[in-house]
């Protein structure tokens, strides 16, 4: 499988936004690339979001996706929003070179995203 690199740990912002870079070493001259973010919890794997893009073009996720991203060469900058403490977990970047053949697939080791819910503001008496 293709080599895919991603940071080991990322801390989400107080607004529940986490960003990380997913970088892959392409063996060939792919024109169509698919990037998928998977969340692994114990033995369960769920798809968080996915986008297919043409090399040189922008990465487009579905309108209702919690992910956004930009691409530059063999690097994809991913942002996941709307995260809450319960979403803390291992987020895996999966990259597939879809076209032209041959098909290549790579799986990153995962980024542990920590999300801390903000403390509610105390009521003020003024």
């Amino acid at each position: 499988a293709m080599h895919v690199a991603q940071p080991a740990v990322v801390l989400a912002s107080s607004r529940g936004i986490a960003s990380f870079v997913c970088e892959y070493a392409s063996p060939g001259k792919a024109t169509e690339v698919r990037v998928t973010v998977l969340r692994q919890a114990d033995s369960q794997v769920t798809e968080v979001c996915a986008a297919t893009y043409m090399m040189g073009n922008e990465l487009t996720f579905l309108d209702d996706s919690i992910c956004t991203g930009t691409s530059s060469g063999n690097q994809v900058n991913l942002t996941i929003q709307g995260l809450r403490a319960m979403d803390t977990g291992l987020y895996i970047c999966k990259v597939e070179l879809m076209y032209p053949p041959p098909y290549y697939l790579g799986i990153g080791n995962g980024t542990q995203i920590y999300v801390i819910d903000p403390e509610p503001c105390p009521d003020s008496d003024f």
Epitope: H3, P27, K29, V45, K94, P101, P102, Y103, I107
Partner: antibody, heavy 115, light 108 residues
């Protein structure tokens, strides 16, 4: 049209050597990780070896059953992959397929190891 | 090493039947799975790549699904030309890139 043509198979005695060749055409050979997969008579498919391409420093991988006996190599200038098979055993008897990525397959060449 | 367990090892179905073949990995493989079709006396052909993508030139009655450890190949309406042995293969590093044991599909 994509073509992978294997050659070099035949009948060989146990302990002897054989070199298989895989000549590719119709696709960009240098973009492909090349594999050898074998199939013993009446049995399933067994992955044997893989050689990656230049961006991956021509890394090689082998199944445990052939490690230390078989060597995979490639010549990108000729679009040929090779499988050097030494110390052959009767259990190496099989049809050997060459594959480009896992997308393209050759027609196979038969290797029979028998005394 | 990750083991690939395919079932059934053989099946016989009627033309037009829906046929399902399963492949289970001993560990999570994140959709890193291909399916191949091998007709009698022929070389294998790539059928499905990346668990769900239909290879060029393959009929749309074939589909792949699954995630995690469990994967399925489905033939929505079996045709006489689908008589073959079907193999799954794990394509996730590290090696070996193990094949399942195969499923021989015949027509009743």
């Amino acid at each position: 049209e994509v073509q992978l043509v294997e050659s070099g198979g035949g009948l060989v005695q146990p302990g002897r050597s054989l070199r298989l060749s895989c000549t590719a055409s119709g696709f960009t050979f240098s973009d492909n990780w090349m594999n050898w997969v074998r199939q013993a008579p009446g049995k399933g498919l067994e992955w044997v070896a893989q050689i990656r391409n230049k961006p991956y420093n021509y890394e090689t991988y082998y199944s445990d059953s052939v490690k230390g006996r078989f060597t995979i190599s490639r010549d990108d200038s000729k679009s040929i992959a090779y499988l050097q098979m030494n110390s052959l055993k009767t259990e190496d008897t099989a049809v050997y397929y060459c594959t480009g990525g896992m997308d393209y397959w050759g027609q196979g060449t038969t290797v029979t190891v028998s005394s | 090493d990750i083991q690939m367990t395919q079932s059934p090892s053989s099946l016989s179905a009627s033309v037009g039947d829906r046929v399902t073949i399963t492949c289970g990995a001993s560990e999570i493989i994140y959709g890193a799975l291909n399916w191949y079709q091998q007709k009698p006396g022929k070389s294998p052909k790539l059928l499905i790549y990346g668990a769900t993508n239909l290879a060029d030139g393959m009929p749309s009655r074939f589909s792949g699904s699954g995630s995690g450890r469990d994967y399925t190949l489905t033939i929505s309406s079996l045709q006489p030309e689908d008589v073959a042995t079907y193999y799954c293969q794990k394509i996730l590093s590290p090696p070996p890139w193990t094949f399942g044991g195969g499923t021989k599909v015949e027509i009743k």
